[in-house]
């Protein structure tokens, strides 16, 4: 047993059929001695009396909100949730395996830029008494700061039957240098509660690895005198490290006809203009990924040719 | 990825070339090893990040581009005296570069060869012949260098009189084909920002 | 204690369909995952599927992909495996078992496909 | 298919010690816990041990279990006549928990 906050703590059991469970001591936080007595959530059974309670702890009923009374007044709380082991593997009931880019990927992160900023996301089914706690740090065993922010339902999407719900969260590395080379990955952890079932979900990776480009910004066409062909030119996002020079892109042009059957055509280029042959009907889209490191491309920006 | 290569034209910042063909080289040769090496710990997740230059070269702080030199962050042990030596400037005019930057990339390098010539005679001696370096990115470090033109002492190529343990070798293969990419990206970063200086 | 009890084999022809039962006492049904495990005759062990307590996620080798569904039913402290399409490789002992360090096997129902 | 692989017989006279090696992958032994389970011939398969090296009360204590790297092994200390049956070994993949990994199976047979 240990204690998540302050009056919550967090029973390990062992999750079989019959387990004999854990049995846990519950101490009232009083100076009284004599008359308390302790009861179960919102039930007025008692369950024992005395300055301290044993209890054994094998399922769900046995966890909850225990109270220590005495003569009608409350002394305090221990909330006890329940962390279940199966087969020498904490359990992952509280959120979906978003199984990309591997299986077991239950958080997944992205950076826009070097900055030391990046988003968390992650997904579940469950829509109500739910709540969830984020840290981060960088390295685990001399851990440097990460600052994040709250966990906010980010979207909610309906498939098939049910109701899919996505929570994220942004988080900042105190002191980021942009061009640093990382040695130690950033460590986030989630703390996830469903009622009284704890599971805590953990993701480790270098921002390098999780770089996606915001797509290129004013994508505009000027058409070439006596050709089909265009020049399409764009810019560097506005969310993406400075100097361009230094944290340089990669471009990939394509043009695209109407139907999705019709053959794409695709050019390569690191500037930031390119000239194709422009058809009716098609459109014209560029993405962008660094130019250096080959993490994300970032979504397509498009116009169309007409 | 297969992209078009662009050949450089011959007024243009002579290294940038050459850094190109280093990171081409790097990725190409970890690829290879991540794939040879299925059965060992050769993946990002897998290894220890160490690098062989720490505490003895200084690159990062020293090829900071200015742009950066504002954030504190990036500060902690950068030190101040501008570039005027090594081919590569050319006949460029750079207020960006400290003394320390173009040098500092080729103590890099010259690291980095001693450790991949040492480790390759070792895995010359394994029976099972499983991997060996790349040639072309021996060589290619050797034509940066090179380019770079900087006269340093010859680091001479460690030997080891013990019975190599094959598995140990591999592994820290992995390491080194890992930091050095990484250092391979922060070269091609300051030779594409010196080349638009 | 804890029991489960099997149901539903025999000898089925090829194409053919076959539902397993798998009945538990003596626990919290509900509150466990449940996996069945077959045995060609003569053979080693084959994991077949996976349920979560709730049922919520479901699991499959990809030998049976597509073929077999696992489902259950907690009100009734069942266990299913609907098997459809059989194909003579599909001859085995089926055994259902509890998720768990410790585990709980049924006594294992005889699947026999031949035409 | 199987990941992990055993011996597919290993032999021994009554006393003699007798071990069972289960070798498998990083993803696989190396990442998770492994379990042992004994199946006598006509009877569903019985566990022995789990988490590695942990024995369920009412297993002999001459069982034992043991994980190293990639690998895990089962030991037998004075094996006996009633020992004689199919051991397997069982772990899961990283990556498709809680699909169950089982090994190849080994027969133990107890001469003389």
């Known amino acids: 047993i240990w204690e998540l906050k302050k009056d919550v703590y967090v029973v390990e059991l062992d999750w079989y059929p019959d387990a004999p469970g854990e049995m846990v001591v519950l101490t009232c936080d009083t100076p009284e001695e004599d008359g308390i007595t302790w009861t179960l959530d919102q039930s007025s059974e008692v369950l024992g009396s005395g300055k301290t309670l044993t209890i054994q702890v094998k399922e769900f009923g046995d966890a909850g909100q225990y109270t220590c009374h005495k003569g009608g007044e409350v002394l305090s709380h221990s909330l006890l949730l329940l962390h279940k082991k199966e087969d020498g593997i904490w359990s992952t009931d509280i959120l979906k395996d978003q199984k990309e880019p591997k299986n077991k990927t239950f958080l997944r992160c992205e950076a826009k830029n070097y900055s030391g900023r990046f988003t968390c996301w992650w997904l579940t089914t469950i829509s109500t008494d739910l709540t969830f706690s984020v840290k981060s740090s960088r390295g685990s065993s001399d851990p440097q700061g990460v600052t994040c922010g709250a966990a906010t339902l980010s979207a909610e999407r309906v498939r098939g039957d049910n109701k899919e719900y996505e929570y994220s969260v942004e988080c900042q590395e105190d002191s980021a240098c942009p061009a640093a080379e990382e040695s130690l990955p950033i460590e986030v952890m989630v703390d996830a509660v469903h009622k009284l079932k704890y599971e805590n979900y953990t993701s480790s990776f270098f921002i390098r690895d999780i770089i996606k480009p915001d797509p290129p910004k004013n994508l505009q066409l000027k058409p070439l005198k006596n050709s089909r062909q265009v020049e399409v030119s764009w810019e560097y996002p506005d969310t993406w490290s400075t100097p361009h020079s230094y944290f340089s892109l990669t471009f990939c042009v394509q043009v695209q006809g109407k139907s999705k059957r019709e053959k794409k055509d695709r050019v390569f280029t690191d500037k930031t203009s390119a000239t194709v042959i422009c058809r009716k009907n098609a459109s014209i889209s560029v993405r962008a990924q660094d130019r250096y490191y080959s993490s994300s491309w970032s979504e397509w920006a498009s116009v169309p040719c007409s | 990825r297969n992209l078009p290569v662009a050949t450089p034209d011959p007024g243009m910042f002579p290294c940038l070339h050459h850094s190109q063909n280093l990171l081409r080289a790097v990725s190409n040769m970890l690829q290879k090893a991540r794939q040879t090496l299925e059965f060992y710990p050769c993946t990002s997740e897998e290894i220890d990040h160490e690098d062989i230059t720490k505490d003895k070269t200084s690159t990062v702080e020293a090829c900071l581009p200015l742009e950066l030199t504002k954030n504190e962050s990036c500060l902690n042990s950068r030190e101040t005296s501008f570039i005027t030596n090594g081919s590569c400037l050319a006949s460029r005019k750079t207020s960006f570069m400290m003394a320390l930057c173009l040098s500092s990339i080729y103590e890099d390098l010259k690291m980095y060869q001693v450790e991949f010539k040492t480790m390759n005679a070792k895995l010359l001696m394994d029976p099972k012949r499983q991997i060996f370096l790349d040639q072309n990115m021996l060589a290619v470090i050797d034509e940066l260098m090179q380019a770079l033109n900087f006269n340093s002492e010859t680091v001479p190529q460690k030997s080891s009189l013990e019975e190599p343990d094959f598995y140990k070798t591999k592994i820290k293969l992995c390491i080194l084909l890992h930091a050095f990419r990484i250092r391979a990206v922060t070269i091609d970063r300051v030779m594409s920002y010196l080349n638009a200086s | 204690q804890v029991q489960l009890v099997q149901s539903g084999g025999g000898v089925v022809q090829p194409g053919r369909s076959l539902r397993l039962s798998c009945a538990a006492s003596?626990?919290?049904?509900?509150?466990?995952?449940m996996h069945w495990v077959r045995q060609a005759p003569g053979k080693g062990l084959e994991w077949v599927a996976f349920?979560?307590?709730?049922?919520?996620?479901?699991y499959y080798a990809d030998s049976v992909k597509g073929r077999f569904t696992i489902s259950r039913d907690n009100s009734k402290n069942t266990l299913y495996l609907q098997m459809k399409s059989l194909r003579a490789e599909d001859t085995a002992v089926y055994y259902c078992?509890?998720?768990?360090?410790?585990?709980?096997w049924g006594q294992g129902t005889m699947v026999t496909v031949s035409s | 298919s199987y990941v992990l692989t055993q011996p597919p017989s290993v032999s021994g006279t009554p006393g003699q010690r007798v071990t069972i090696s289960c070798s498998g992958g990083?993803?696989?032994?190396?990442?998770?816990?492994v379990k042992w389970y004994q199946q006598l011939p006509g009877t569903a398969p019985k566990l022995l041990i789990y988490?590695?090296?942990q024995r369920p009360s009412g297993v002999p204590d001459r069982f034992s279990g043991s994980k190293s790297g990639t690998s895990a092994s089962l030991a037998i200390t004075g094996v006996q006549a009633e020992d004689e049956a199919d051991y397997y070994c069982?772990?899961?993949?990283?990556?498709?928990?809680?699909?169950?990994?089982f090994g190849t199976g080994t027969k133990v047979t107890v001469l003389g």
């Open positions: 078992k509890t998720h768990g360090s410790h585990d709980n």
């Open positions: 003596g626990f919290t049904f509900s509150s466990y995952g």
């Open positions: 349920i979560r307590y709730d049922g919520s996620n479901k």
């Open positions: 990083r993803s696989n032994i190396g990442s998770t816990t």
């Open positions: 988490g590695n090296d």
């Open positions: 069982q772990s899961y993949d990283r990556g498709t928990h809680p699909a169950l990994l």
